[in-house]
């Protein structure tokens, strides 16, 4: 704390608040009888700038010229030093350095709406660090003037509170802003404008949309605007899109027909307004209107596939599968699928509506020629039916694709490749690649996936519904007219050694050999496609290496004979399973002693 100048005075010229770059004169003078005891020439006056000595003088007063002070506050303290005593504070001074206002730039004025008030903004320029008074002046026709002041360090906006009217839209108005602080003043360049230049219309309101006869092709957008609006621009987009469609309209009078909307799509609409073709500015965009366009009947055709399963000598099961139409093809909410099954020679037909599923299973006689047609229906109509003749898809051996392989291709993808069939490859009209999770029971409830490939392709990347560590049964069909040939293979996108080995559930003796039966490894423990089983055996209590028999994996197989065991010797047996990544741990161990004679 600095004492309140009891021993002397500090005077400052020209002021305690100075312009950046200017000089300040600081004088420190002792009051009478306030110097050092005995001799005044022993008085040593010292001037400090913060804690640093910058000047001293022997006598009753000290005069110092200071330059180069930074923006903001600098503290000076005058002290008296006498021989054999501590320095005594005399008085202090704070000098504040600021900046004269720069010329305000980019003065622009706006009136929001025909009933709004004129408000102006500008760029202040460099911070003055000082209280700066801004005066905004507006002069108009008939020597009318308005003035508004704002007394704030950071002022860059003022509202006159007056409303310009359209009586004489071409009349000129001039605005100017002047900044004044204790270090100087500066005025902007004048900004001259007319009513039409500065009135920015209010955004349109009360936006509505109407579809005549519930049709997307007869759509009108309605809105309300201020009275003088001449131009509008409309923008609209599907709610899930980032790109806007833009339309400019003149003298729209609050309505416009839109011709290119897609059916059954939620759109966002916004409108902006302007008073004059080339003067003034566009209003803000209106609040968004969100509306869904009406449905139209579906376009496109369903992608249909099927599976045949033999039941007995007279009956077969047909399972039909189809893919959903894309949103742009469905053009509405699909209410049901219509499936028609027809025997082509007898003409008998049955039709069924399916809701909530994209598959249908039925049982038909094995005799006769059968065809199906499947279409999708929404509230406005149905898609064109997809017709398929039911045939034996794998009957034509010469049409079977050759050298089918399935290889992992990155995460959760399988690349299926093949060679064209031996029979004239040009006869192939298309390939269908089908895949489903491999289930030992051949479960028909397992979802079926397929994709179609052009006749010149010899590979397909399958990625839909592919999971890691699951084995898929993959078939490639070559279709030609009413014939088909197929080849199959197992494949997985990612594999590792199975988590467990098969569980031996029985060992039986048959004519000097044994039959081992086992339970399949649970699908979730197989960890990919099984390639082999191994059966191990060795004499009980023996340290010798076990013998083994390797069996290629077949889906339906769960027993195998072994005929190399010695009679009346107790053996320990166990099994493992192998994928391309390695061998599982042991399954359970079983002991067995063959009773019969050795072979």
């Amino acid at each position: 704390k600095i004492d309140a100048c009891k021993r002397g005075d500090v005077t400052v010229k020209p002021s305690h608040v100075i312009l950046l770059g200017s000089t300040v004169n600081i004088t420190c003078s002792l009051k009478p009888r306030q110097g050092c005891f005995h001799y005044s020439r022993r008085n040593k006056l010292i001037l400090y700038k913060f804690d640093r000595r910058i000047n001293f003088h022997h006598g009753h007063s000290l005069n110092s010229q200071v330059t180069g002070l930074p923006l903001g506050t600098t503290l000076f303290v005058c002290k008296l030093a006498c021989i054999n005593s501590d320095e005594i504070q005399i008085c202090g001074a704070e000098i504040f350095v600021g900046v004269a206002p720069e010329q305000p730039q980019n003065l622009s004025c706006i009136q929001k709406g025909e009933q709004g008030t004129v408000a102006c903004t500008w760029e202040r320029g460099r911070d003055t660090h000082l209280y700066t008074e801004y005066t905004l002046q507006l002069s108009g026709p008939k020597n009318l003037t308005w003035q508004k002041q704002c007394k704030d360090i950071y002022c860059d906006y003022l509202d006159f509170g007056i409303n310009l009217t359209p009586e004489s839209p071409e009349s000129n108005f001039t605005a100017k802003v002047t900044a004044v602080n204790s270090l100087g003043s500066s005025s902007s360049l004048p900004s001259t404008f007319t009513f039409l230049d500065i009135v920015r219309p209010l955004p349109p309101w009360d936006i509505r949309i109407k579809f005549q006869k519930a049709s997307v092709s007869r759509c009108t957008l309605y809105w309300r605007d201020e009275g003088l609006v001449l131009l509008n621009r409309l923008r609209y987009r599907p709610s899930n899109s980032r790109l806007w469609n833009m339309v400019n309209v003149t003298k729209a009078k609050g309505r416009h027909d839109l011709l290119d909307l897609k059916p059954f799509t939620e759109y966002e609409f916004q409108i902006s307004s302007k008073l004059h073709l080339y003067k003034g500015s566009w209003s803000d965009w209106s609040e968004s209107l969100r509306a869904q366009t009406p449905e139209e009947e579906p376009t496109g055709m369903l992608d249909v596939w099927y599976m045949k399963r033999h039941i007995d000598y007279s009956r077969q099961q047909i399972s039909l599968f189809w893919k959903n139409l894309s949103v742009s093809e469905a053009r509405g909410k699909i209410l049901h699928y219509q499936v028609t099954l027809q025997e082509l020679t007898g003409g008998k037909a049955m039709t069924q509506n399916i809701t909530g599923h994209t598959s249908w299973t039925t049982v038909i006689p094995r005799t006769g020629n059968w065809a199906v047609a499947v279409s999708a229906a929404n509230s406005k109509g149905s898609s064109l039916p997809t017709r398929i003749n039911i045939m034996n898809l794998c009957e034509a051996g010469l049409l079977a694709p050759r050298q089918v392989s399935a290889n992992s291709e990155g995460m959760d993808n399988i690349l299926v490749t093949w060679q064209p069939p031996r029979k004239d490859p040009s006869a192939v009209q298309e390939y269908v690649v089908e895949w489903r999770e491999l289930h030992p029971g051949g479960d028909t409830q397992v979802p079926l996936n397929w994709l179609r490939s052009r006749p010149y392709n010899v590979s397909a990347l399958i990625s839909e519904n592919i999971k890691s560590y699951i084995c898929y049964e993959i078939r490639v069909y070559a279709l030609s007219g009413d014939q088909g040939g197929c080849s199959s293979i197992l494949g997985n996108s990612k594999h590792k050694a199975p988590l467990s080995g098969p569980h031996i559930n029985a060992i039986t003796e048959e004519k000097g050999s044994i039959l081992i039966s086992w339970n399949s490894i649970p699908v979730q423990e197989q960890m990919g496609c099984l390639l082999h089983y191994r059966i191990y055996w060795k004499e009980r209590d023996s340290n010798s290496q076990p013998q083994l028999c390797e069996i290629p994996y077949r889906v339906s197989q769960n027993s195998h004979p072994i005929n190399s065991l010695q009679p009346r010797v107790t053996y320990v047996l166990w099994m493992t399973a192998l994928t391309a990544a390695g061998e599982s741990s042991h399954g359970n161990e079983r002991e067995f002693c063959l009773q019969g004679k050795a072979n």
């Epitope: 400052v12 608040v17 704070e94 007394k151």
Partner: nanobody
Amino acid sequence: QVQLQESGGGLVQAGGSLVLSCAASGSAALIFLMSWYRQAPGKQRELVAEVSRYGSTTYADSVEGRFTISRDNAKNIVDLQMNSLKPEDTAAYYCKADQYYGDSLRSSWGRGTQVTVSS
């Protein structure tokens, strides 16, 4: 912001004395500088004298030796002792307070008090 109230103005004979007083109220903390300005009819407003919170002073050349500015920091009062008054000292006298506002100065002004020196 600070509110300033001036008092002490009036009519005085040339050569006479007056004391103007200015009291600061409101958020009067951290008042860096208290000043007296004057504005004669048809002229620019000019600095008369100022006093910092540490007691240092500045005087206009025209009043040096005749006027004395003093400040009571505790009460936020600034006085201007005016001696040997001249007719050219006739003006409206305004009190001003500069307060710290972040790293800037914010100014507040009083409404003014009239001093008239007759010859």
